[in-house]
């Protein structure tokens, strides 16, 4: 019952079992997703404009399942995807065609996550396996950062696929799966 | 604007294999959960199988061995083999709330007839 | 195989009336609320109405209603349109051997 899907590289299961605080109560409709919440915050960089419009980083809210191979999560969890661009596109003009063209010029931000929580879900599995206590690393709030050639670069990905650590002691499955079935799927509502 | 639709529907002899294909846009299949639903004539709707974002797939008992979800990059597929009369339905793709199972298929596709006749 | 079983298969109400429809699963759902409700009407693919036993889906009325926990579940339809005459739908997710999915028969509701 309930089929969507959106991965989130930011996002990932945390094998160590620590003190975290508690979730956060889960969304009462969905009409708190996809919630701009921060489509007019202040700029996180010394650019120098009257427009704070053109800054566009976004925290969108989301809702998802976490999954691992056949295994999800009980419940739903709720985080953000950092959406838009971040710093004035300068008007400049196009000796072409003589009119006005769009150009990012100055420092490259981003808008990608800055804070992250931990939150604990209990994983279920098929065939009568015990359910999982794990970790998974949300995002929590996203800002316009500068880019340096020392930025993780995965921070910048557009939500693609993400690899899964090793689960230790896992039993093999006899069901065929496809190769990409064993990563840790971040499944969400967008 | 987010949209599925089904093809490959036709009229096909007992025992013939058919493939279903859904074409999604709009959204990424890489990261989205489809399910196929089928509707016979007149009748309710029957769940087939889903396939998850990392490409893990569950099936209904009966569809077992019979039924197949794979999916490209803009396209689900449901692939049927040994086709009956019973198998006469319209074919749902469908795309939902949650990933995974869990809440609520929200986006469907209008469906294609197949029609299983000697 | 799961089984849901809903009651009663046709029902007829009038305009102003109030509805209720019931679903009954031959085991518990996933988390217990791992059920939603759909509507649909001829021609059409369904709608999603509730999900998480309880949840409004976007866009649908508040007249809606949907409870229950477990094995046992209602929707309720209160102030009823002309526009709710439909067939409506619980589907249920489950957890055994392997993850499925499961609709319920089916209810007709006839407006007068």
């Known amino acids: 019952q309930g089929w969507q899907a959106f991965k989130n590289d930011a996002t990932e299961i945390i094998p160590e079992l620590g003190e975290y605080p508690e979730p956060p109560p889960e969304l009462e409709n969905n009409k708190t997703m996809n919630r701009a919440e921060n489509g007019g915050r202040p700029p996180h960089h010394p650019f120098e404009t009257k427009d704070v419009s053109e800054y566009s980083c976004r925290e969108l809210h989301f809702t998802r399942y976490v999954t691992d191979g056949p295994c999800r999560s009980a419940k739903p969890v709720t985080e953000l995807v950092c959406s838009g661009q971040c710093g004035p596109a300068r008007l400049l003009p196009n000796a072409i065609g003589r009119g006005k063209w769009w150009r990012p010029s100055g420092p490259d931000f981003r808008c990608i996550p800055d804070r992250y929580r931990a939150q604990r879900v209990q994983l279920l599995c098929p065939g009568g396996e015990a359910p999982r206590a794990r970790k998974v690393r949300l995002v929590a709030s996203c800002k316009c950062k500068r880019l340096t050639r020392f930025h993780n670069q995965s921070e910048l990905k557009d939500f693609g696929t993400e690899a899964a650590r090793p689960q230790k002691g896992r039993k093999p499955r006899p069901r065929a799966r496809s190769a990409k079935a064993n990563q840790a799927e971040l499944e969400n509502a967008y | 604007c987010q949209s599925v639709e089904e093809s490959g529907g036709r009229l096909v002899t007992p025992g013939t294999p058919l493939t279903l294909t859904c074409k999604v846009s709009?959204?990424?299949?890489?990261?989205?959960?489809m399910n196929w639903v089928r509707q016979a004539p007149g009748k309710g709707l029957e769940w087939i199988g889903a396939?998850?974002?990392?490409?893990y797939t569950y099936y209904a008992t009966w569809a077992k061995g019979r039924f197949t979800i794979s999916r490209t990059s803009t396209t689900v597929d449901l692939k049927m083999t040994s086709l009956t009369a019973a198998d006469t339905a319209t074919y749902f793709c469908?795309?939902?709330?949650?990933?995974?199972?869990?809440?609520?298929?929200?986006?469907w596709g209008p469906g294609t007839l197949v029609t299983v006749s000697s | 195989a799961q089984l849901l079983t809903q009651t009663p298969p046709s029902v007829s109400a009038a305009v102003g009336g109030t509805v209720t429809i019931s679903c009954q699963s031959s085991?518990?759902?996933?988390?217990?609320?791992?059920l939603a409700w759909y509507q649909q009407k001829p021609g059409q693919p369904p709608k999603l109405l509730i999900y998480f036993a309880s949840t409004l889906a976007s866009g649908v009325p508040s007249r809606f209603k949907g409870s229950g926990s477990g094995t046992q579940f209602t929707l309720t339809i209160s102030d009823v349109q002309c526009d709710d005459a439909a067939t409506y739908y619980c589907q249920g997710t489950y957890l055994s051997d392997d993850w499925s999915d499961a609709f319920g028969g089916g209810t007709e509701v006839v407006v007068k």
């Open positions: 709009g959204f990424s299949l890489s990261s989205s959960v």
């Open positions: 469908a795309r939902g709330q949650f990933g995974a199972s869990g809440g609520g298929d929200v986006l």
């Open positions: 085991q518990s759902v996933v988390n217990n609320n791992n």
């Open positions: 396939i998850w974002s990392g490409g």
